[in-house]
């Protein structure tokens, strides 16, 4: 199966290799502009150079191309705790990320958030924080997992999933709270 | 010999639209960049708008993004700028230009006049 | 966008004498993708210099320019009548292209 081409993708496989063929004569193929620049104007015949003009400030083309406009530059989002690692250059976008101490939870394709990573209090480290997940934690005795923080078993109620990791512990508390005195 | 004729100027109210033509000769029209210069009364120049030889890029200065709208109809060697919610700031003469290939504004049309007031 | 400051703003000069034009970018000036342009009264603009230093067709030679980056310069070798006028420098690498405020040659 040929995989379904674009009119532009298309058009430019008329042309070779960095190269894409003039949007008003399709007998002339004019050279992509490299990143960084943008297509200001085509060129006016075969041999010629293409009329390609540097990004403004704000905008940048990551690779080459024949578009008609750079593009925008991106914001990193600030209420997702994002920082900016690198400036937006015109050849390359922003890019963003967490500070120390911080994974991404992606909320979609393009949007994440930045969270603290677990710190595995009354717990141990089972496999460390990364990029893109938090810290998975260990408990130790006593204590049973609820949002990747170790928690009392006191704080374990029977109907919850941590029953079976506490369970002596509850029956424990049951049986105090069963006993009154005569 | 390189020819460009300006026309549509005139009286106009704030508020108002004009639409200005810039009739082309002596070149291969299609192949390049046609720019819009203003002028206003006893100042300097400024960079209005500017349209690729295709047609299919156009730029604009910020002072006239979202009014202005240039286009071309390079059957007809013809250059338009369609000027809608006109303040009394656009006054002005309004020179079409040719820009050389990779280049500046290498001719210069004699401008048409527009004075927006009431 | 890129500033373009011209000084001085009128230059007094007699028919024969050397003019210098400057032209001062707020930041440099891509390729050298500057222009410089005269403008007598009533009339259109006219294309000196490109590239910051390549003539124009039918440019006479006593028109130069020179200069790269942020700083260039126009030097009219010997003034002749005809060459008291208004003189911009202009921009054109990056968007919006931009215009100096203008120098005027004038006679003394």
């Known amino acids: 199966l040929v995989p379904h081409l674009g009119d532009r993708e298309k058009r430019d496989s008329v042309c070779p290799q960095g190269k894409y063929i003039h949007p008003q004569n399709n007998s002339i193929c004019c050279t992509k502009c490299h990143k960084g620049t943008y297509l200001y104007n085509d060129c006016p015949g075969p041999g010629q150079d293409t009329d390609c003009r540097e990004c403004e400030s704000g905008s940048f083309t990551a690779s080459e191309n024949h578009l008609r406009h750079c593009l925008s530059c991106s914001k990193c989002r600030k209420e997702m705790g994002q920082v900016e690692i690198s400036s937006c250059t015109v050849d390359r976008d922003t890019v963003c990320g967490c500070r120390k101490n911080q994974y991404r939870h992606y909320w979609s394709e393009n949007l994440f958030q930045c969270f603290n990573c677990s710190l595995c209090l009354n717990g141990t480290v089972h496999l460390s924080c990364q990029e893109k997940q938090n810290t998975v934690c260990t408990c130790h005795a006593g204590f049973f997992l609820r949002e990747n923080e170790c928690v009392s078993c006191s704080n374990c109620k029977k109907s919850l999933e941590c029953t079976k990791l506490c369970l002596p512990q509850i029956e424990n508390v049951k049986g105090t709270e069963d006993s009154g005195t005569t | 010999e390189v020819q460009l004729l300006e026309s549509g100027g005139g009286l106009v109210q704030p508020g108002g639209s004009l639409r200005l033509s810039c009739a082309a000769s002596g070149f291969t029209f299609s192949t390049y960049v046609m720019s819009w210069v203003r002028q206003a009364p006893g100042k300097g120049l400024e960079w209005v708008s500017s349209?690729?030889?295709?047609?299919?890029?156009?730029y604009y200065a910020d002072s006239v993004k979202g009014r202005f709208t240039i286009s071309r109809d390079n059957s007809k060697n013809t250059l338009y700028l369609q000027m809608n919610s006109l303040r009394a700031e656009d006054t002005a003469v309004y020179y079409c230009a040719k820009e050389a290939h990779r280049g500046p504004f290498d001719y210069w049309g004699q401008g048409t006049l527009v004075t927006v007031s009431s | 966008e890129i500033v373009l400051t011209q000084s001085p703003g009128t230059l007094s000069l007699s028919p024969g004498e050397r003019a210098t034009l400057s032209c001062r970018a707020s930041?440099?000036?891509?390729?050298?993708?500057l222009a410089w342009h005269q403008q007598k009264p009533g009339q259109a603009p006219r294309l000196l210099i490109y590239?910051?230093?390549s003539r124009a067709t039918g440019i006479p030679d006593r028109f130069s320019g020179s200069g790269s980056g942020t700083d260039f310069t126009l030097t009219i070798s010997r003034l002749e009548p005809e060459d008291f006028a208004v003189y911009y420098c202009q921009q054109y690498g990056s968007s919006p292209w931009t215009f100096g405020q203008g120098t005027k040659v004038e006679i003394k």
């Open positions: 930041q440099s000036v891509s390729s050298s993708y």
């Open positions: 349209i690729s030889g295709s047609g299919l890029g156009s």
């Open positions: 590239g910051a230093s």
